[in-house]
């Protein structure tokens, strides 16, 4: 056959759907690869063709659109399953073509099973709520296009395994779930089950997301350098190892880049000839505040090194701070036989 622009297997769009539930999958060509939409393509005489490769098979085969009750169908640029079966898992290809043009892309579809508490291998989206904020809402995701606006579905919300009713600060409001003055105990997996009728049948859509309660921007502060500080002096003799920790606390800030770095005599350690190593560790609080520690290490410090300026720097979206470490050379203890004896007039 003639040449076709093959975009390959689009693994960025690893689509997961639940077994025995409706699924509508849009051909990724129009969303991510081509500069025109399906309507334009269709009116230009292009045809959209679907086929698939079953899991653990190499053979591409056409999709059977003649199954009982139209279990699999195509509508414009959407492939419909009403509902899915476990063995629908595989790589699906949509191809747009006419006599002079051809473009296609494949994508993996995984049909997954869930247990009675909605646990499954499904990758869950994470929704962050700010601690103690007044009202915050999550919305049952990815249910658009499954039923017309004239159909009024029933929506049931669950936290973990438990139906949400009479929860003190979590209130189901149709497609939305409202959190009043969120606490860390609101962390968890929340599931909406949307039930709707279609052609005398009842379908269920299950959508689970993870809620993570994080620090509020209202409480956010610029980075706080706990170490080095004015109370600790790093007193070393030449030849000893110099270890200086830089420990910085960062308030949680959505999409903020937290940075910690050392300068030695105003330069980055990479830009100087000293044999210095820096090791970093990061820990997080329950509200995702962050503590970063960078330990500056000089294995065998010289008297020149002990005269240098060692400054810890930190930056977040809230501001930039810096703190110098107090480094000095240890004065050697006097040797009695020489220094002290001389002091007493001994010869």
């Amino acid at each position: 056959s003639e040449r076709c622009d093959d975009w390959g297997l689009d693994t960025m769009r690893q689509i997961q759907v639940f077994e025995d539930e409706p699924a509508r999958i849009k051909c990724p060509l129009f969303e991510h690869f081509l500069k025109f939409n399906y309507s334009t393509a269709h009116s230009a005489g292009l045809t959209l063709i679907w086929y698939w490769t079953r899991q653990d098979r190499d053979l591409e085969e056409p999709i059977n659109f003649r199954l009982p009750e139209n279990r699999i169908s195509k509508e414009k640029d959407v492939l419909w399953f009403r509902p899915t079966l476990l063995n629908d898992t595989g790589n699906y290809t949509c191809m747009l073509r006419n006599t002079t043009y051809c473009s296609k892309v494949a994508f993996p579809l995984e049909v997954v099973q869930k247990d009675s508490c909605f646990n499954s291998p499904m990758k869950l989206p994470v929704h962050k709520l700010y601690i103690e904020y007044g009202i915050q809402r999550i919305t049952c995701p990815n249910v658009d296009g499954y039923f017309p606006s004239s159909v009024k579905p029933t929506i049931t919300w669950y936290m973990g395994c438990y139906k949400i009713q009479n929860f003190n600060n979590v209130i189901p409001e149709g497609m939305n779930l409202s959190f009043l003055i969120a606490l860390i105990s609101n962390n968890g997996n929340y599931t909406c089950v949307v039930t709707y009728p279609e052609n005398g049948r009842t379908f269920h859509l299950t959508r689970t997301l993870t809620v993570k309660v994080v620090g509020s921007p209202k409480n956010a502060v610029p980075p706080v350098i706990h170490s080095p500080n004015d109370h600790v002096v790093y007193e070393k003799e030449p030849g000893e190892e110099l270890l200086i920790p830089c420990t910085v606390y960062f308030s949680f800030l959505m999409d903020s880049r937290n940075e910690v770095w050392w300068t030695i005599d105003g330069k980055k350690p990479d830009d100087i000839t000293i044999d210095v190593t820096i090791n970093e560790s990061i820990s997080h609080s329950r509200t995702e505040d962050e503590t970063r520690t960078q330990i500056l290490s000089i294995k065998k410090v010289t008297s020149e090194d002990l005269k240098r300026s060692y400054v810890c720097h930190a930056r977040s979206a809230k501001g930039e701070v810096a703190k110098a470490a107090k480094v000095k050379q240890k004065v050697p203890a006097p040797r009695y036989t020489v220094e002290l004896a001389c002091g007493f007039g001994a010869t």
Epitope: I131, E132, Y133, G134, I135, N168, N169, L180, I181, L183, I184, S185, K218, N219
Partner: antibody, heavy 118, light 107 residues
């Protein structure tokens, strides 16, 4: 110095209404959640209601839900509790308290006595 | 709601002695537990939050421990001003709930 000063308590008949106020000073009022906690004579402490720093989120104990309304005016640094359909069992000293998730109720007012009796 | 149970209801201790107060939650509250002291005619005062962190200005003789469902407030050497009622309170879940209180009285 953080100060919370309640007012508005008094004697009211069953079924009556009362509005408590709590004037706050010594901290940025609009940064903190606030609560009302009550204590019936000779009894323990009972959380009544909470309001978020922005006034949008409000929570109530089941015993007062539908009868009490918590609100705040951040421009006046004042917290309110509107109490309707009062019952004899609402008789208590009502305290306002500042809260943070990390530190619970860290500051309390001195309380105002509400007596519901015919 | 989470039920907080304190024991004993009353604790009789001599000044200078150690006092140990217990608080149990009906389900885990992690370390989101506070202790308050209340003297007659006064408002409660925060002593301990986060199960073990002393609030500002609280003497070192007060210490808290525990996590999950079992918590303890210890007063290492009772002073005359420590005789009062002590309440534990969970702030893990709404509604925030208090224990019924332990009265520490002079023996």
């Amino acid at each position: 110095e953080v100060q919370l000063l309640e007012s508005g308590g008094g004697l009211v008949q069953p079924g009556g209404s009362l509005r408590l106020s709590c004037a706050a000073s010594g901290f940025i009022f609009s940064h903190y959640g606030m609560s009302w906690v009550r204590q019936a004579p000779g009894k323990g402490l009972e959380w009544v209601s909470a309001i978020s720093y922005d006034g949008e989120g409000t929570l109530y104990a089941d015993s007062v839900k539908g009868r009490f309304t918590i609100s705040r005016d951040n421009s006046k640094n004042t917290l309110y509790l509107q109490m309707n359909s009062l019952r004899a069992e609402d008789t208590a000293v009502y305290y306002c308290a500042r809260f943070r998730y990390y530190t619970a109720f860290d500051y309390w007012g001195q309380g105002t006595l509400v007596t519901v009796s015919s | 709601e989470i039920v907080m149970t304190q024991s004993p209801a009353t604790l009789s201790v001599s000044p200078g002695e150690r006092a140990t107060l217990s608080c149990r939650a009906s389900q885990s509250v992690s370390s989101n537990l506070a202790w308050y002291q209340q003297k007659p005619g006064q408002a409660p005062r925060l002593l301990i939050y986060g199960a073990s962190t002393r609030a500002t200005g609280i003497p070192a003789r007060f210490s808290g421990s525990g996590s999950g469902t079992e918590f303890t407030l210890t007063i290492s050497s009772l002073q005359s001003e420590d005789f009062a009622v002590y309440y534990c309170q969970q702030y893990n879940n709404w509604p925030w709930t208090f224990g019924q209180g332990t009265k520490v009285e002079i023996k």
